[in-house]
C-alpha cells in the first residue's frame, strides 16, 4: 500500500493584516482512518489552530466540508489576520486510536503578515521654551510589519537632520514600532511653524503617513517693552504709554507702579494677531503732574506666561512742568528694561 502523504503545496503565504489567509492541505489517501489537525509551530510547544472534532475556533473555517465522504482536502481559512498570526502552520494527520497517534505532518506553510504602521503621533515638550533654545519632538508609530520603515522630520517643509530614530524590537518579531526624536532650534518667527513626522512603509500606497505638531504649543516669545510719554495735556495730565510688542502666547499681565506703588493692573485679552502669530498690546497711564511735588517714577511691569516680571521705568520730571495750563514740556525717559 502507498504511504500516505500530507501535502502543503505552499512553502509560504503572505497576507495583509485584516485579510483572510487560506492554508492549503491535501492528503494522498483516505487510509488510515483518523483526523487532521492544524498546528502553529512544531515540537512540544506547538499551538493547536484547528481540530474538526472538538474545540472552538471562531476565526478558522474549513475550506471544504470535512465531514463529506472521501474528503481529502483539509485546507483552512483564517479570517481577520493580525501580525500575531504570523508563523509556520502544519497540517498533521493522526491515526484513530485511544488516544489518536500522530502519523504524518505536512512540510509546513509559513504565514507572513504585512501590516501598516499606525498614524504617527507627534508630541512636543511639556513646557514652553524661548526662541534660540532647542526643544525635542517625539514621533511614534506602531504595529507595522515587515520591519523596514523610513521616518523623516520636516520643519516648514525643510528636512531636519538632528534626529535619532529607533525601531523595536531589534530582533525578529510579529510587528514593530518606531520612535524618533527630533531636536528643533526655535526662533522668534516660529509661532506659525509646524513640524511634520513622515513615515513610509511598503504597505502604504506610495503616500507616507504624517503626524504634525505646531510649534505654537512649544514656544514662548518674550515681549519687548517701550515706555514713552505723550505731550502734556491742557489739564496738566501727562499720558504715558507702555508698548508691549511681539509676544506669544497671549497670557500677559501688566501692572503700572507709581513710585513703587501699584497704580493699576490689567490682563491682556482678545488681542489681534500679528502676521507672525505674535501679539502687541499698548497700555496708557494718565499722570496728574499738578498733584505731585517731586518727579514721578513710573514703572511698567509685565508678567508674561508665568515668567519672572520684566520692568521698564520712566521718570516724569515734575520740575519741568510749570503748573499753568498749556505747558507742553517733554518728560525725560530714564527707563531701562529691568527683570525682577
Amino acid at each position: 500500500e502507498e504511504e500516505l502523504q500530507v501535502i502543503q503545496p505552499e512553502k509560504s503565504v503572505s497576507v495583509a493584516a485584516g485579510d483572510s489567509a487560506t492554508l492549503n492541505c491535501t492528503v494522498s489517501s483516505l487510509i488510515p482512518v483518523g483526523p487532521i489537525q492544524w498546528f502553529r509551530g512544531a515540537g512540544p510547544g506547538r499551538e493547536l489552530i484547528y481540530n474538526l472534532k472538538e474545540g472552538h475556533f471562531p476565526r478558522v473555517t474549513a475550506v471544504s466540508d470535512p465531514t463529506k465522504r472521501n474528503n481529502m482536502d483539509f485546507s483552512i481559512r483564517i479570517s481577520n489576520i493580525t501580525p500575531a498570526d504570523a508563523g509556520t502552520y502544519y497540517c498533521v494527520k493522526f491515526r484513530k486510536g485511544s488516544p489518536d497517534v500522530e502519523l504524518k505532518s505536512g512540510a509546513g506553510t509559513e504565514l507572513s503578515v504585512r501590516a501598516k504602521p499606525s498614524a504617527p503621533v507627534v508630541s512636543g515638550p511639556a513646557v514652553r521654551a524661548t526662541a534660540e533654545h532647542t526643544v525635542s519632538f517625539t514621533c511614534e508609530s506602531h504595529g507595522f510589519s515587515p520591519r523596514d520603515i523610513t521616518l523623516k522630520w520636516f520643519k516648514n517643509g525643510n528636512e531636519l537632520s538632528d534626529v535619532q530614530t529607533n525601531v523595536d524590537p531589534a530582533g525578529k518579531s510579529v510587528s514593530y514600532s518606531i520612535r524618533s526624536t527630533a531636536r528643533v532650534l526655535l526662533t522668534r518667527r516660529d509661532v506659525h511653524s509646524q513640524v511634520i513626522c513622515e513615515v513610509a512603509h511598503v504597505t502604504l500606497q506610495g503616500d507616507p503617513l504624517r503626524g504634525t505638531a505646531n510649534l505654537s504649543e512649544a514656544i514662548r516669545v518674550p515681549p519687548f517693552l517701550e515706555v514713552t510719554q505723550q505731550s502734556m495735556r491742557a489739564d496738566n495730565q501727562v499720558n504715558v504709554t507702555c508698548q508691549v510688542t511681539k509676544f506669544y502666547p497671549q497670557r500677559l499681565q501688566l501692572t503700572w507702579l507709581e513710585n513703587g506703588n501699584v497704580s493699576r493692573t490689567e490682563m491682556a485679552s482678545a488681542l489681534p494677531e500679528n502676521k507672525d502669530g505674535t501679539y502687541n498690546w499698548t497700555s496708557w497711564l494718565l499722570v496728574n503732574v499738578s498733584a505731585h511735588r517731586d518727579d514721578v517714577k513710573l514703572t511698567c511691569q509685565v508678567e508674561h506666561d508665568g515668567q519672572p516680571a520684566v520692568n521698564k521705568s520712566f521718570s516724569v520730571k515734575v520740575s519741568a512742568h510749570p503748573k499753568e495750563q498749556g505747558s507742553n514740556t517733554a518728560a525725560e525717559n530714564t527707563g531701562t528694561n529691568e527683570r525682577n
Partner: antibody
Amino acid sequence: VQLVESGGRLGQPGTPLTLSCTVSGFSLSSYVMGWFRQAPGKGLEYIGIISSSGSPYYASWVNGRFTISKTSTTMDLKMNSLRSEDTATYFCARVGPLGVDYFNIWGPGTLVTVSS
Amino acid sequence: DIQMTQSPSSLSASVGDRVTITCRASQSINSYLAWYQQKPGKAPKLLIYSASFLYSGVPSRFSGSGSGTDFTLTISSLQPEDFATYYCQSWHYISRSYTFGQGTKVEIK
C-alpha cells in the same frame, strides 16, 4: 481587473507625446500605478510611479523629461520632447495589494517609435 | 541607485531540467525582490514577490529564495511553456525606487 495603454504612435524628435493607461475593475485612488518601458530587444526599465493620492515619483534618469498624472480612471505619461532613444513599448502596471514592492497587473503595452 | 545583476544572461535547457537563475543587488534590499516572466510581444507576468512568495495562479514548480543581496529563482522541472525571458526587480525601501535585472533568456536546448 484590467489595464490598457493607448497613445503609442510614430513621433518626431523634439515633439511631445502623451500616453494613457485606462483601468477597470479597481479604483486608481487605492493603488500605486507605474510606468515602464522596453526598447526593442532590451530589458525592462522603470520610469516612475504615481501614488494613490496623486503624487508622482520618477526614476533618477527621467530628469523632468516625463510627467505622470492621473484622473479617476486613467493615468497619463506625458513625454515632453521625444528622443530617438525613447523608442520602446511602454507598459503601465499596478502594484500588488500587499505593498508597493511588486507589480501584479500589467497592461499589454503600447509602442512608441521616434523617427524623423 | 541600486544595480541588479542577473546571471546567466541566457541559458539552454531541456524540458524536465531544473533551472536556476540568480540575481545580485549592489546593496541590501532585504526581501523586496520580485521575479517576472515575459514572452515575446507580451507584458511581464509576476511569478514571485517578496523573494519567496509564489503569486496566486503560478505553478508550484517556480520558487524563489534569498534575502539581502543574493536571490535565486528556481524552476524545478522545466515545461515547454516556461521558455521565456525572466527578470528580477528590486524595490529599495529608503529611496523607494525600482530596478530591474537585465534579464535571463531561457531557450530550448
